[in-house]
């Protein structure tokens, strides 16, 4: 299976060829397609945990109620159907940290 930070190149043979996530994307592994990082600032929230290539950012409300942290998702790096397509506003700012890179390849 494709490990964290990578995704299958061929949906018909998942886990055979795995490529790294594009910049600004993450995959928890297990043959899941890479998805865009959440931008907490854009959502009007604090970043509780920054994104990496294997996990999304975790956001919390600026005045946190007694609820779980919320996450949002942006569009894919390319218009492909296996990734989310919800549009973001045009003024997002990127995370201040760079992701730790997990090598591509098979797990």
């Amino acid at each position: 299976r494709c490990r964290a930070g990578t995704q299958p190149l061929d949906s018909y043979k998942p886990g055979v060829d795995c490529a790294p996530c594009p910049p600004g994307h993450f995959s928890p592994g297990d043959n899941q397609a890479c998805k865009p990082w959440t931008n907490c600032t854009l959502a009007g929230k604090h970043t509780l945990q920054p994104a990496s290539n294997s996990s999304d950012a975790i956001c919390e409300d600026r005045d946190p109620p007694a609820t779980q942290p919320q996450e949002t998702q942006g569009p894919p790096a390319r218009p492909i159907t296996v990734q989310p397509t919800e549009a973001w506003p045009r003024t997002s700012q990127g995370p201040s940290t760079r992701p730790v890179e997990v090598p591509g390849g098979r797990a």
Epitope: P20, P22, P23, G24, C34, P36, P75, G94, E101
Partner: antibody
């Protein structure tokens, strides 16, 4: 049509910095990752890194990570590459290149015309 | 880093010739290989991705094959506009790396 237009040639002193721009048109800039590749005179291609304009997430070649900064301005559909602590070996043509649109493949389907950066004392 | 070694580094051929360029990866890259054409003073152009899939608008005389560590770009009948330098690229892992190039010259 889809087009990437880069800034003009630069001549820099060793130790200084250079910032190259790449203006995109003909597609939704924020939805495609933008990469930078350089080519020294008479040499092959070397990948520098890439950025996803929608959230600013970036991935760098470790050979450049301490000296390069990639940014993107969605309001002007422009990507930037800044390289610091320049040395003579950085003399090259610098290209911006859009990652292609076919699934998860990290190849480059549209390229800028290139920006020549010359580092000389 | 994954090294991509192309051979030959240059070759001379005539219009109508069948030309074969090879690219060898230093480790298994599955089918995660692209090929580009570059003419003097110009930016590279994508020809092939996923080892054998022609990019939009690329003539059928260009074909790619291979998987694992050995890849081939074939031009079935060389045309005047094909005299250029050709590069392979792997994208199974970061950093993305290119071959050293093969210059196809007129005999």
């Amino acid at each position: 049509q889809v087009q990437l237009v880069q800034s003009g040639a630069e001549v820099k002193k060793p130790g200084s910095s250079v910032k190259v721009s790449c203006k995109a048109s003909g597609y939704t800039f924020k939805d495609y990752t933008m990469h930078w590749v350089r080519q020294a005179p008479g040499q092959g291609l070397e990948w520098i890194g890439g950025i996803y304009p929608n959230n600013g997430g970036s991935t760098y070649n470790q050979n450049f990570k301490d000296r390069v900064t990639l940014t993107a301005d969605k309001s002007t559909s422009t990507a930037y590459m800044e390289l610091s602590s320049l040395r003579s070996e950085d003399t090259a043509v610098y290209y911006c290149a859009r990652m292609g649109y076919h699934g998860p493949h990290l190849d480059f389907d549209v390229w800028g015309q290139g920006t020549t950066v010359t580092v000389s004392s | 880093d994954i090294q991509m070694t192309q051979s030959p580094s240059s070759l001379s051929a005539s219009v109508g010739d069948r030309v074969t360029i090879t690219c060898k990866a230093s480790q298994d890259v599955g089918a995660a290989v692209a090929w580009y054409q570059q003419k003097p003073g110009k930016a590279p152009k994508l020809l092939i991705y996923w080892a054998s899939t022609r990019h939009t608008g690329v003539p059928s005389r260009f074909s790619g094959s291979g998987s694992g560590t050995d890849f081939t770009l074939t031009i079935s009948s060389l045309q005047p506009e094909d005299f250029a330098t050709y590069y392979c690229q792997q994208y199974i892992n970061y950093p993305l790396t290119f071959g050293g190039g093969t210059k196809v010259e007129i005999k």
